[in-house]
Amino acid sequence: EPPTACREKQYLINSQCCSLCQPGQKLVSDCTEFTETECLPCGESEFLDTWNRETHCHQHKYCDPNLGLRVQQKGTSETDTICTCEEGWHCTSEACESCVLHRSCSPGFGVKQIATGVSDTICEPCPVGFFSNVSSAFEKCHPWTSCETKDLVVQQAGTNKTDVVCGPQDRLR
């Protein structure tokens, strides 16, 4: 009686159970009554990540630098290449098919709203009493240092890009 179902890591073909090819190998020919399944290793830059009966291996993913991508983990015959984004860039999807640079706010501006998957960074000018001296996609405007609370006086006024400079009070002799 020919089988109707096969064990794990086998497949049914021509009324008989053949072994699947192991990960990293592709099917060349099905088994017969007299021969085992014939499999061949995947070529360079190819992979198969499951027990399979595929006749072609899959191409490794290409991490396109024009899309801001770089290789996080090189592919093997059993695994695909994993891409990630260049430093300061962010994947546009879970599959990380491309990247975007979340824009930075200039010195003199702070981040009003951090970038999301829907909207880019929103910047706002630092109002009087606040400053930002960096280009950043995360930093808000910082308040000027309060010299008075440190029992100091303002020696140099702050701007939208610089903090105040505090100094000692002149003591009357």
């Epitope: 801001g68 930075s104 200039s106 003199g108 909207s119 880019d120 280009s135 939208n160």
Partner: antibody, heavy 119, light 112 residues
Framework: QSVEESGGRLVTPGTPLTLACTVS????????MSWVRQAPGKGLEWIGI?????NTYYASWAKGRFTISKASTTVDLKMTSLTTEDTATYFC????????????????WGPGTLVTVSS | DIVMTQTPASVEAAVGGTVTIKCQAS??????LAWYQQKPGQPPKLLMY???DLASGVPSRFKGSGSGTEYTLTISDLECADAATYYC??????????????FGGGTEVVVK
């Protein structure tokens, strides 16, 4: 706060030309400045931008032929190899997004200066 | 290049009516979109930024919406003074993208 362009005139094809944009009450070390042009009866065309730290970004067609630079209260647009297709009113405008790179949205515009390229 | 496509090229509506102008980007621009109004012989005027934020002094009859690649400007309770050409502009920057033109082709609004 205001912006005014100057330097537009009638030139022959191939002549280089530099336009100036003079700002008043605008700190060019804080705000970005862009150049936009408009051919007669046509739409707006973005040329490029100079950011607060003097980095420049250009439309793909403008790269190499247009150069934006700035001093304390002026922003220049240097144009080379002019053709009749460059005939347009050229606008200078302040960008207010606060970004450290790339293009910006524009809130204060000059009245424009007309450049006519004709033989 | 990111390409901005604006429709329609022209639209006519009566005083008190509503017009809708669409702007489509060739890739997601993450709500980095502005709208401008331009009248003959004048420079453009900023109406809207970040897709839906009204610029200072712009009446609330102007409404912006959209995300990703699709954006809309709606003008309701049309007034004669709204007769003008309207432009969208993308200011999105990914660090590598370029623009042939950051502006859409424009939409002429005629008020009857």
């Amino acid at each position: 706060q205001s912006v005014e362009e100057s330097g537009g005139r009638l030139v022959t094809p191939g002549t280089p030309l530099t336009l100036a944009c003079t700002v008043s009450g605008i700190d060019l070390s804080t705000w970005t400045m862009s150049w936009v042009r408009q051919a007669p009866g046509k739409g707006l065309e973005w040329i490029g931008i100079i950011n607060s730290d003097s980095n420049t970004y250009y439309a793909s067609w403008a790269k190499g032929r247009f150069t934006i630079s700035k001093a304390s209260t002026t922003v220049d647009l240097k144009m080379t190899s002019l053709t009749t297709e460059d005939t347009a009113t050229y606008f200078c405008a302040r960008g207010v997004g606060g970004y450290s790179s790339g293009p910006d949205y524009l809130d204060i515009w000059g009245p424009g200066t007309l450049v006519t390229v004709s033989s | 290049d990111i390409v901005m496509t604006q429709t329609p090229a022209s639209v006519e509506a009566a005083v008190g009516g509503t017009v809708t102008i669409k702007c489509q980007a060739s890739q997601s621009i993450y709500r980095s979109l502005a709208w401008y109004q331009q009248k003959p012989g004048q420079p453009p005027k900023l109406l809207m930024y970040h897709a839906s934020d009204l610029a200072s002094g712009v009446p609330s009859r102007f409404k912006g919406s959209g995300s990703g690649t699709e954006y809309t400007l709606t003008i309701s309770d049309l007034e004669c003074a709204d007769a003008a050409t309207y432009y969208c502009q993308s200011y999105y920057y990914s660090g590598i993208n370029t623009y042939g033109n950051a502006f859409g082709g424009g939409t002429e609004v005629v008020v009857k």
